[in-house]
Amino acid sequence: TTPEPCELDDEDFRCVCNFSEPQPDWSEAFQCVSAVEVEIHAGGLNLEPFLKRVDADADPRQYADTVKALRVRRLTVGAAQVPAQLLVGALRVLAYSRLKELTLEDLKITGTMPPLPLEATGLALSSLRLRNVSWATGRSWLAELQQWLKPGLKVLSIAQAHSPAFSCEQVRAFPALTSLDLSDNPGLGERGLMAALCPHKFPAIQNLALRNTGMETPTGVCAALAAAGVQPHSLDLSHNSLRATVNPSAPRCMWSSALNSLNLSFAGLEQVPKGLPAKLRVLDLSCNRLNRAPQPDELPEVDNLTLDGNPFLVPGTALPHEGSMNSGVVPAC
């Protein structure tokens, strides 16, 4: 017997559906109506035939009461080829729900998204996460998707994007967006970051994550942030192959005084990079290749410093003199 495609936990909190059959019984998903967290994985299916079975242009208000009754707050949809029209239909219906967090992963969106009808209401998400989502519309995808969302989005995460740069002139400002995560876009680079950080479209950013994004130097990132007018409080540059030295011909970049937390862990650094902010609350340099202790002008003033997992601290990799101190903690790097 084939396993049930959907599983609801005992608390009716989390429901996960894996539709791997070529002709799945989508009605199985109805057992998820009581769940708060719902995950639907479509096994890479093309949902084009769905368009024939549903009226994507139907007025979603007829479903409003039913949708409002749903408990779902977090929804993940993955592994499918989805016509843009179908996605829009789903967003229009979900606009009446209490959904707060939407994750789309391993999706191929085909066709163009129609504009938001005047009478339609946007989806009031606080968090939108996209991983490996491709859009037929290329660089304008964010602007097209944005019009279907209310302006209160707080968290936006875009990983493994096929086009991490956006058509900035079409994108409206995200006035409430405090966290932007562009991690796991190894082809982004510092030039791509400048293109992705549409100037003045992200005025409220506090947390910016750029893990594994092909960044080269902290100074280059500083320049991209300055150009975009983005002033995060927290910046994560971990898991990039960073160079410690700055090109002498490159102009010196002044970090925003708002920045108080910088993560440079797992960055392959052999020395503390030049051109860091003068003062930080948190600096994470763990799991790098620092083979000697920093001298006083090589570190900014930091309240909370993490250096664990560097060769100069790991017993056996260097000969510490009598009385030298290491943390005694050797993390798995």
Partner: antibody, heavy 125, light 108 residues
Framework: QIQLVQSGPELKKPGESVKISCKAS????????MNWVKQAPGNGLKWMGW????????TYADDFKQRFVFSLETSASTAYLQINNLNIEDTATYFC??????????????????WGPGTSVTVSS | DIVMTQSPTSISISVGERVTMNCKAS??????VDWYQQKTGQSPKLLIY???NRYTGVPDRFTGSGSGTDFTFTISNMQAVDLAVYYC??????????FGGGTKLELK
């Protein structure tokens, strides 16, 4: 073992210059910053500043920004303190001392773990 | 610059007694205070770093405590060999670093 050996005592006239050496052995010279500390007769210790032994960049305390020069001869694992245009108030013992980095679960800093024996400089007309 | 005020300037003490001296920073220095011992005609020696950590080879009769602006250095069982001048130094994470004026230990 780790040692800092300083040059011998100096007797100078006002207006002259003096250059004191501090030769390090027993450790990798360029891994630790070198500091200079002044002690006038009967007085306490006064931190003069330090030099980054990787880059050669000196940092001077406010009272020592004018006539004082820190330098290195890395190949000889030696740090130097030069005082120009000497005056009576420069009469003191000058110590070199290595600053060692300390780190333990988020807390860090430097302390002076090895000191040279001091070089006495007397300025008298 | 941060000013380190040490008190008292001198203490008369007998062998075997407990001796305590203080150091006050003009602003918060966290736990960034070290204590050094200087005997007549010698260079200073590190005893305590980061307010309370005893340096390698330093006898356990020497202890340090405090944080913020107030720091204390104690010799629990005074020995004749401990006669010296003791200096506190603030080693806040970025220079300039400053020493206190010193406390001289003398025999009663």
């Amino acid at each position: 073992q780790i040692q800092l050996v300083q040059s011998g005592p100096e007797l100078k006239k006002p207006g002259e210059s003096v250059k004191i050496s501090c030769k390090a052995s027993g450790y990798t010279f360029t891994d630790y910053a070198m500091n200079w500390v002044k002690q006038a007769p009967g007085n306490g210790l006064k931190w003069m500043g330090w030099i980054n032994t990787q880059t050669g960049k000196p940092t001077y305390a406010d009272d020592f920004k004018q006539r004082f020069v820190f330098s290195l001869e890395t190949s000889a694992s030696t740090a130097y303190l030069q005082i120009n245009n000497l005056n009576i108030e420069d009469t003191a013992t000058y110590f070199c001392t290595r600053s060692t980095f300390y780190y333990s679960s988020y807390i860090y800093g430097w302390y002076f773990d090895f000191w040279g024996p001091g070089t006495s400089v007397t300025v008298s007309s | 610059d941060i000013v380190m005020t040490q008190s008292p300037t001198s203490i008369s003490i007998s062998v075997g007694e407990r001796v305590t001296m203080n150091c006050k920073a003009s602003q918060n220095v966290g736990s960034n205070v070290d204590w050094y011992q200087q005997k007549t005609g010698q260079s200073p020696k590190l005893l305590i770093y980061k307010a309370s950590n005893r340096y390698t080879g330093v006898p356990d009769r020497f202890t340090g405590s405090g944080s913020g602006t107030d720091f204390t250095f104690t010799i629990s069982n005074m020995q004749a060999v401990d006669l010296a001048v003791y200096y506190c130094m603030q080693s806040n994470t970025n220079p300039p670093w400053t020493f206190g004026g010193g406390t001289k230990l003398e025999l009663k």
